[in-house]
């Protein structure tokens, strides 16, 4: 089955620059299929823009400005690229790649879409580190004791642009766990978002990962924030014990600072 | 030019209660086209649901039913038993791929219909309230309540900033919420919740223990043992530079 990945969830450009949006095809040989590009402007219908066929023929939708869009494909990397020249306000949209995929039964076809790349146009290139800065929250003792479950919370702050994807996995598993999240909120010129995962008691002794995709992650790779296993058999201690908390005796937690 | 027009801009549905989406074709006969349905969820992911001639996307056949009403020139998509996972924007789209003659393999989309999912009406349920802290950050976790109306108050004399709460449907079909804030005196912050004309405090749920030993480190990795069984583990982030933040449990 064909699968489309658009590694960039967003692409932020200043006016008149060139944007290159990538689409990686797997499960199908790119040179044996056509790749289509669509755009969805805010509040508008999704619109076909341009396609490149298996033999390299490019077809553009009528009414699309000439010279604005260029499409190509690189069989070696199984990638199609949409190039948007001279970006301007009217180009603000989410861009999707798509292809027709043959179904098992009776050779029927369906069109599958990539996850989309949002093109953002801004007034200035931000010099500061605007990758998401994580803070982790571990389950409260009360929750683990009373409900035989624990909630991990992953807070991400000071990022720009506002496009971000968060999912959760157990340490040695690729299964995406069911989590919940708040809306992305604006704080001055950057954004914040949080996501939380509630796991049953039996999973509390496993390590969990909050995986964050953002345009400005260091080296363009997903950021993984690791939540340590939780010990649920709480030991009651004498408050005068060496373990009593004071200003210098809090749990140390390493968190990422992805500034250069 | 043809146009696909959804019947509604927004359709609220209740969990488990069947819902129907309709999309009419203007300017052409619907029979001349194949109709497709897609769902776009929060992360912008466009997932194929249905294509005329009984083709369903993986995982959709059991809970969705597509149909064409030739007489009324409209396409119909039924969600047989909606769950919170079915929230999103639903799009109808048409093409003429494989119809022979002058065919188009591009899709022509209609505007989306936003499907919002709400729990079905049920007995009122009082929330559980828990506080989670890290440095100046405090999160108030409010679990498994119904109905939705709720006021969450983080109690502190030294507020830095607070954020609007996130209220979502829980997997069990009730509501969960989280409110986040930053406070200079985070250690003393508690959470009180007003729900159904009652007040619930995070302190009502506190377990009487003096323990700070809540994180179980790996035996050999990243641990420091100042005394007894009081470990100070470190959570690892896979990137180069690292800074330290305090974690208060």
């Amino acid at each position: 089955a064909g699968h489309l990945e658009q590694p960039q969830i967003s692409s932020t450009k200043t006016l008149s620059k060139t944007a290159r949006l990538e689409c990686v095809v797997s499960g199908i040989t790119i040179s044996a299929t056509s790749v289509y590009w669509y755009r969805e402007r805010p509040g508008e219908v999704i619109q076909f823009l341009v396609s490149i066929s298996y033999d390299g023929t490019v077809r553009k939708e009528s009414g699309i400005p000439s010279g604005k869009f260029e499409v190509d494909r690189i069989p070696e990397t199984s990638t199609s690229t949409l190039t948007i020249h001279n970006v301007e306000k009217q180009d603000i949209a989410t861009y999707y790649c798509a292809l027709w995929e043959a179904q098992q039964e009776l050779g029927k076809k369906i069109k599958v879409f990539g996850p989309g790349t949002k093109l953002i146009i801004t007034d200035k290139q931000l010099d500061a580190d605007v990758s998401p800065k994580p803070t982790i929250f571990l389950p409260s003792i009360a929750e683990t004791k009373l409900q035989k479950a624990g909630t991990y919370l992953c807070l991400l702050e000071k990022f720009f642009p506002d496009v971000i994807k968060i999912h959760w996995q157990e340490k040695k598993s690729n299964t995406i766990l069911g989590s919940q999240e708040g809306n992305t909120m604006k704080t001055n010129d950057t954004y914040m978002k949080f996501s939380w995962l509630t796991v049953p008691e039996k999973s509390l002794d496993k390590e969990h990962r909050c995986i964050v995709r953002h345009e400005n992650n260091k080296n363009g790779v997903d950021q993984e924030i690791i939540f340590p296993p939780i010990k649920t058999d709480v030991i009651t201690m004498d408050p005068k014990d060496n373990c009593s908390k004071d200003a210098n005796d809090t749990l140390l937690l390493q968190l990422t600072n992805t500034s250069a | 030019a043809i146009e696909l027009v959804p019947e509604h801009q927004t359709v609220p549905v209740s969990i488990g209660v069947p819902a129907t989406l309709r999309c009419s074709m203007k300017g052409e006969a619907i029979g001349n086209y194949y109709i497709n349905w897609y769902r776009k969820t929060q992360g912008n992911t466009m997932t194929f649901i249905y294509r005329e001639k009984d083709i369903y996307g993986p995982g959709f056949k059991d809970n969705f039913q597509g149909d064409i009403d030739i007489a009324k020139n409209l396409a119909v998509l039924k969600i047989l038993a909606p769950s919170e996972r079915d929230e999103g924007s639903y799009y109808c789209a048409c093409d003429t791929l494989g119809m022979g003659g002058e065919y188009t393999d591009k899709l022509i989309f209609g505007k989306g219909t936003r499907v919002t999912v709400e729990p079905r009406s049920q007995p009122h349920t009082k929330p559980s309230v828990f506080v989670m802290k890290n440095g100046t950050n405090v999160a108030c976790l409010v679990k498994e309540f119904y109905p939705k109306d709720i006021r969450i108050n983080l109690v502190s004399s030294k507020k830095i900033t607070e954020f609007d709460p996130a209220i979502v449907i829980s997997p069990s079909g009730k509501y969960n919420a989280v409110k986040l804030g930053k406070y200079e005196d985070s250690n003393s912050v508690t959470c009180s919740v007003q729900h159904d004309n009652k007040t619930v405090h995070s302190t009502d749920f506190e377990v009487k223990t003096d323990s700070t030993d809540h994180v179980k480190p790996k035996e050999t990795e990243n641990t420091k043992q100042p005394s007894k069984s009081c470990h100070k583990p470190k959570a690892i982030v896979h990137t180069e530079k690292v800074n330290m933040m305090s974690l208060t449990v």
Epitope: N86, E88, T122, K186, D189 | Q9
Partner: antibody, heavy 126, light 109 residues
Framework: EVQLVQSGGGLVKPGGSLRLSCAAS????????MNWVRQAPGKGLEWVSS????????YYADSVKGRFTISRDNARNSLFLQMSSLRAEDTAVYYC???????????????????WGQGTTVTVSS | EIVMTQSPGTLSLSPGERATLSCRAS???????LAWYQQKPGQAPRLLIY???SRATGIPDRFSGSGSGTDFTLTISRLEPEDFALYYC??????????FGQGTKVEIK
Amino acid sequence: EVQLVQSGGGLVKPGGSLRLSCAASGFTFSNYDMNWVRQAPGKGLEWVSSISSSSSYIYYADSVKGRFTISRDNARNSLFLQMSSLRAEDTAVYYCAREIGVTGTTYYQDYGMDVWGQGTTVTVSS
Amino acid sequence: EIVMTQSPGTLSLSPGERATLSCRASQSFSSNYLAWYQQKPGQAPRLLIYGASSRATGIPDRFSGSGSGTDFTLTISRLEPEDFALYYCQQYGSSPPFTFGQGTKVEIK
């Protein structure tokens, strides 16, 4: 000071032509989409045409399509409206107007005309 | 084409009163795409509100905008003498034309 100064209006016979100009100053003209809006005597506002910052996207109202041409010269900070085959119903005050560019969000994503020219009168009469 | 209908046509009020102007679209569009303008006789229009609810630079906070989908409202909390004028809403919906409403006149009672 941010301003738009218009010129080129006047009296013209039906079927005739006219070219309106709009000179921009006080801002980076090439960063902004631009519009023409008109107002017939005693009537409301009517959007006429718009052009994107690099001229890729050009739109017209149905009432002027095929007769009016919008253009811009970013090097000269100027916007133009070439009007031909003029009709009596084209009589109006014509305004050039700048589209909102960047707002506090640092995104180019909102719409509205935040700077307007003083207006120029076009009268089509025999 | 999206048709914008403003109501009422004329609003007769006294200074200090609250004015509520309505603008209804024939089809829904993103609230990013709605603007309100004020126009006084012999003057060019002036942008008040963009994105349905964001005040333009220099606009007093007695002006506020709200709404989404097809129904939008401009509210002037306390009318000042200089607020008596014509008000227009405008949409930049999915495709041109970017139509204006027919206007609401706010006059002194």
